[in-house]
């Protein structure tokens, strides 16, 4: 398993919530992305391809998420100080092979200014 700090802006704040950006290489066709808070799985999203190149998106731990061709964004709302923690994007690449797991992350700091406009 490869571990490292995200070398991009992982946290994007808006309206009392945060978008956590988990990037993956654009060559990746099938994968599972998990968002970890400390060691706890908060969210996951799995993209697989079936016969005829039909794309299937599944989520065992559902969060509001957004998929693009090189990233998964997970959205957390109603931020408070308890959200401050290390967050990790745990990427398991199934296709193309070989199977590979990468873990990248960063610390989410919560400041008063980010709590002002709560999204209800």
């Amino acid at each position: 398993e490869i571990n490292g700090s995200a070398n991009y802006e992982m946290f994007i704040f808006h309206n009392g919530g945060v978008q956590i950006l988990c990037k993956y290489p654009d060559i990746v066709q099938q994968f599972k992305m998990q968002l970890l808070k400390g060691g706890q799985i908060l969210c996951d999203l799995t993209k697989t391809k079936g016969s005829g190149n039909t794309v299937s998106i599944k989520s065992l731990k559902f969060c509001h998420s957004q998929l693009s061709n090189n990233s998964v964004s997970f959205f957390l709302y109603n931020l408070d100080h308890s959200h401050a923690n290390y967050y990790f994007c745990n990427l398991s690449i199934f296709d193309p092979p070989p199977f590979k797991v990468t873990l990248t992350g960063g610390y989410l700091h919560i400041y008063e200014s980010q709590l002002c406009c709560q999204l209800k």
């Epitope: 654009d26 092979p97 070989p98 199977f99």
Partner: antibody
Amino acid sequence: QVTLRESGPALVKPTQTLTLTCTFSGFSLSTSGMCVSWIRQPPGKALEWLALIDWDDDKFYSTSLKTRLTISKDTSKNQVVLTMTNMDPVDTATYYCARMSTPTYYGLDVWGQGTTVTVSS
Amino acid sequence: DIQMTQSPSSLSASVGDRVTITCRASQGISSWLAWYQQKPEKAPKSLIYAASSLQSGVPSRFSGSGSGTDFTLTISSLQPEDFATYYCQQYNSYPLTFGGGTKVEIK
């Protein structure tokens, strides 16, 4: 045209560290999906995979040799370097580097000609 | 680690024979298997990737089949230049692993 060429010492002494360089052309290790791997073959024996480095600098090693191996890349020079510590006569082998291009599923599609390393005092 | 077991370890055959080499993985590897040919004092050459796809420039007498754990390399009509050692290799997961090789000798 894709080519790879291995270079390094022909003879090393036991306990020394071996440094091998793979110089390649025809592709770039900064291209998404590209990887370079090292493989060795002792005289009269089977191929043994050693290590691989990929485009985003992730590194993978043989389970039995990982404590002795380090792989690195210099993208600007089109080179991959493998170091192997604490060499022993059983490490006498021909060492190959090979390209693997993951998004095309080709396996180790192009190999260097190999460099022979003898470990002896 | 995934173990790759090849059989037989050697075989004798004549020009024109149909030759079959098998490779078994210790766990499922989908179709992520490659076959290589190696002649004495030469580097291996890639023959087949993704279990059944022929590398560019490889003669059509070579074919591969299988998925999961059991795979086969077939040479439909053995030619003099085909006498060599053949290796399978999985690239489903790290560490990558090779089979022990099959030496095809002249009968």
